[in-house]
């Protein structure tokens, strides 16, 4: 049998059953999530669930830029350091940098400090690039 690899929306990239869209425009976290949803297909800010997935994403983004942090779909909606993925994925894989997670930093970004392989928490109102994900 021939198994066709699903296609992603134009400008998105495919990896292991998921499509990813990297957007180099500035949004706060909630507007970024709403924009991801607006693309349909059940898209959300991206969940990153393994080192392999993180490495693939990091390699892709590094081809565009290496200095700007990028919103992902991890947040702390109750503001109690109880982090969860906005798409409902299980929060098992963790890749936090050593930065403090205190204050009003309740949304997660891929940090440019370690080639986008680690995450930092940041204020959700900050305007940043963002990464969307959906399963085609």
């Amino acid at each position: 049998d021939i198994i066709m690899r699903p296609s992603c929306a134009p400008g998105w990239f495919y990896h292991k059953s998921n499509c990813y869209g990297y957007f180099r425009k500035l949004r706060n976290w909630s507007d970024a999530e709403l924009e991801c949803q607006s693309y349909g297909n059940g898209a959300h800010l991206a969940s990153i669930l393994s080192l392999k997935e993180a490495s693939t994403i990091a390699e892709y983004i590094s081809g565009y830029q290496r200095s700007q942090p990028i919103w992902i779909g991890l947040h702390d909606p109750q503001k109690r350091q109880q982090w969860q993925w906005i798409d409902g994925a299980m929060y098992l894989y963790r890749s936090w940098s050593g930065k403090s997670m205190g204050g009003n930093k309740h949304c997660a970004e891929m940090s440019s400090n370690n080639n986008f392989l680690t995450w930092s928490s940041n204020e959700c109102n900050k305007r940043q690039h963002f990464l969307c994900k959906y399963r085609p």
Epitope: K25, L26, N28, D31, N104, N125, K126, R127
Partner: antibody, heavy 118, light 109 residues
Framework: QVQLQESGPGLVKPSETLSLTCTVS??????????WAWIRQPPGKGLEWIAS???????DYSPSLRSRVSMSVDRSLNHVSLRLTSLTAADTATYYC??????????WGRGTLVTVSS | YVLTQPPSASGTPGQRVTISCSGS????????VYWYQQLPGTAPKLLIY???QRPSGVPDRFSGSKSGTSASLAISGLRSEDEADYYC???????????FGTGTKVTVL
């Protein structure tokens, strides 16, 4: 209830530098996750966004004013400052300070009128 | 000004008035539109956020909508206290900054 109060010189000469301060009350700049913005309105005209700054100093500037504008945050005094250089009569306006949540402005200060004239 | 509005609009008490706001793909086309009301001699106030949402305290006579690169603000049941300047605004991805509309003066006849 967050309140913003702008203060400035009122009258400035052409070619000089304008310094304005926005004092924030009812909120702590470095504990609230907001940008703080400056918006101006020439007499009888529309609104123009100048710049927004986060408490950590991250700032976004209007492309048309970027070369003349700088913003800073004084977390100890809980205020935000704007500097606009090389003033001309076209910079005469009411200057407003506003809280910026990353996509909109709310609330706004009352504004302070700055006249550029010799 | 990157966003275009009609300079004026008017109506009698009780009437419905609509204000348009036209932009481009980099601002209104790909970002939320916000509306601000500026009563005479006062600072602007947020009236509509995220295209069609009203902050608490804003009467439901005010409504916003967006289609493509154009947005509109409707005031139904016009009242004398609605006499003000109205501005649309949006983030612009090309400029990486906010842009405002030219403003519309609403007069209650």
């Amino acid at each position: 209830q967050v309140q913003l109060q702008e203060s400035g010189p009122g009258l400035v000469k052409p070619s000089e530098t304008l310094s304005l301060t926005c004092t924030v009350s009812g909120d702590s700049i470095d504990k609230s996750s907001y940008y703080w913005a400056w918006i101006r309105q020439p007499p009888g005209k529309g609104l123009e966004w100048i710049a927004s700054v986060f408490y950590d100093g991250t700032a976004d500037y209007s492309p048309s004013l970027r070369s003349r504008v700088s913003m800073s945050v004084d977390r100890s005094l809980n205020h935000v400052s704007l500097r606009l250089t090389s003033l001309t009569a076209a910079d005469t306006a009411t200057y407003y300070c506003a809280r910026d949540d990353g996509s909109s402005f709310d609330p706004w200060g009352r504004g302070t009128l700055v006249t550029v004239s010799s | 000004y990157v966003l275009t509005q009609p300079p004026s609009a008017s109506g009698t008490p009780g009437q419905r008035v609509t204000i348009s706001c036209s932009g481009s793909s980099s601002n209104t086309g790909s970002n939320y539109v916000y509306w601000y009301q500026q009563l005479p001699g006062t600072a602007p106030k947020l009236l509509i956020y995220r295209n069609n949402q009203r902050p608490s305290g804003v009467p439901d006579r005010f409504s916003g909508s967006k289609s493509g690169t154009s947005a509109s603000l409707a005031i139904s049941g016009l009242r004398s206290e609605d006499e003000a300047d109205y501005y649309c605004a949006a983030w612009d991805d090309s400029l990486s900054g906010y842009v405002f509309g030219t403003g519309t003066k609403v007069t209650v006849l």
